[in-house]
Interface confidence: low
Amino acid sequence: LTLVAPSSVFEGDSIVLKCQGEQNWKIQKMAYHKDNKELSVFKKFSDFLIQSAVLSDSGNYFCSTKGQLFLWDKTSNIVKIKVQELFQRPVLTASSFQPIEGGPVSLKCETRLSPQRLDVQLQFCFFRENQVLGSGWSSSPELQISAVWSEDTGSYWCKAETVTHRIRKQSLQSQIHVQRIPISNVSLEIRAPGGQVTEGQKLILLCSVAGGTGNVTFSWYREATGTSMGKKTQRSLSAELEIPAVKESDAGKYYCRADNGHVPIQSKVVNIPVRIPVSRPVLTLRSPGAQAAVGDLLELHCEALRGSPPILYQFYHEDVTLGNSSAPSGGGASFNLSLTAEHSGNYSCEANNGLGAQCSEAVPVSISGPDGYRRDLMTAGV
């Protein structure tokens, strides 16, 4: 009686055991044995098939036949079958097992194929807890994670399998602990068009941290009231609070606070002055009498009722600049003119505080001639 079987196979291979003997017709029953344990009994000569070999299938195999109850007539030779490992149990390695939050991590599922089976193709899958990472099964034994966060802390492992799914092995679990960096150096900056906070225009309060990882909650406060003006939570080192149209009443002291789950850190207080563009000025003409005559001293007074100082006023006769005058602390400014016959015509003024210029309405002036006849001096203002 002869047992024909391969002596060396790899995991996943099929094993066919063939028991061959003479005068097969006299055999009532036959059996296959492994390590003296009966595997399977047949009523006639049959092959025994191991569909997909595993390491534990290694052992000493033989077959036997029997003709009478409980007695085995013949026993075959013993074939020692060694099932070899197709590839080693994978090992999960990481570029860092304590990565900094927000930084990248590279995972590698390392295994080694048997030198006799280097052409077998494997595919790999990475897991965190019980969740598949990336796009699942891949031909690459590496997985690049562009950024990890504190919630990515946990047990990681990988699986390697033959592309035919016959042999699958998984690595031991490895703990990856994502390190969170506390907030440091919080600052509040003002961003405004032209660098000045101007009434009616947009204002951005930029709260920044020099360091810190993970979700950061930024809050903005007005010192006078202590109330929060707004709150934003995001994965970044800065956040903006926008005031679409600043009011004069928005002037004051502000600070911001940043918190990523450690100790909240507060910025220094920043004073925000709100600059007011000048309103349309009013031009007023004053002379010694009710009427202006040649030789009189005429005072031109220009005043913008609203506007942050300093304000520069320009005085015009028709389109000729007569002169200018400044109001460093606000209010109006005057310009004096000794009248001649040529001074008849339209007068105007312009106010400018760097946030825009505004021009007054024109005021017409009539000067009396040398005959001493006076015409009315009209004053106007808006």
């Epitope: 996943g12 291979d13 052409d119 077998v120 193709q121 595919q123 031909s139 690459s140 033959t162 592309v163 035919t164 799914h165 016959r166």
Partner: antibody, heavy 116, light 107 residues
Framework: QVQLQQSGPELVKPGASVKISCKAS????????MNWVKQSHGKSPEWIGR????????FFNQNFKDKATLTVDKSSNTAHMELLSLTSDDSAVYYC?????????WGQGTTLTVSS | DIVMTQSHKFMSTSVGDRVSITCKAS??????VAWYQQKPGQSPKLLIF???TRHTGVPDRFTGSGSGTDFTLTIGNVQSEDLADYFC?????????FGGGTKLEIK
């Protein structure tokens, strides 16, 4: 050694179907994917699809989804590709190739001519 | 589908020279690229994959490099038997796609 032996050239009429075969030897047939590739004259290869002989699972290039049917016969270690509703555009050399991603072994090719 | 572009349809070189064939992917394919050689009247043969590993029996004058979208097959010390078409292929995502090919001519 690894060999992929393809069936001979075919001359068929438009509208007909044809079945091309690829017999594998020298390796465990169920352990490797079998791919099919089309190469029209003077053109670069075009991946049609692949089949897992172990369980019959198929993956297709959408351009060939309704054109090709992939099957295997494990008892004879043979992969088959049937091409349906043939037109002159289907005239080309068809290759079988072993592998999941890159094709490390190729058949010698089967020339298909579709002509009335 | 990912498009693989081989900008040179033809390249001419002399025996003993060094020549580089390039391939550009329309999107990032990592390192999932292979190179094939096809001699006239023959089926393609795998040269290189991943994208610098030589297939069994491929002479070491064939080398591959690149990642992301740009890949290069370099043949150092070109031999007359290297006259062939060379194709790149991406296997980063289905469907796997091939480049248009570069025909290497020996002067």
């Amino acid at each position: 050694q690894v060999q992929l032996q393809q069936s001979g050239p075919e001359l068929v009429k438009p509208g007909a179907s044809v079945k091309i075969s690829c017999k594998a030897s020298g390796f465990s047939f169920t352990a490797y994917f079998m791919n099919w590739v089309k190469q029209s004259h003077g053109k670069s290869p075009e991946w049609i699809g692949r089949i897992n002989p172990y369980n019959g699972e198929t993956f297709f290039n959408q351009n060939f989804k309704d054109k090709a049917t992939l099957t295997v016969d494990k008892s004879s270690n043979t992969a088959h590709m049937e091409l349906l509703s043939l037109t002159s555009d289907d005239s080309a050399v068809y290759y079988c190739g072993r592998g999941l991603y890159y094709l490390n072994y190729w058949g010698q090719g089967t020339t298909l001519t579709v002509s009335s | 589908d990912i498009v693989m572009t081989q900008s040179h349809k033809f390249m001419s070189t002399s025996v003993g020279d060094r020549v580089s064939i390039t391939c550009k992917a329309s999107q990032d394919v990592g390192t999932a690229v292979a190179w094939y050689q096809q001699k006239p009247g023959q089926s393609p043969k795998l040269l290189i994959f991943w994208p610098s590993t030589r297939h069994t029996g491929v002479p070491d004058r064939f080398t591959g490099s690149g990642s992301g979208t740009d890949f290069t097959l370099t043949i150092g010390n070109v031999q007359s038997e290297d006259l062939a078409d060379y194709f790149c292929q991406q296997f980063s995502s289905l469907p796997h796609t091939f480049g248009g090919g570069t025909k290497l001519e020996i002067k």
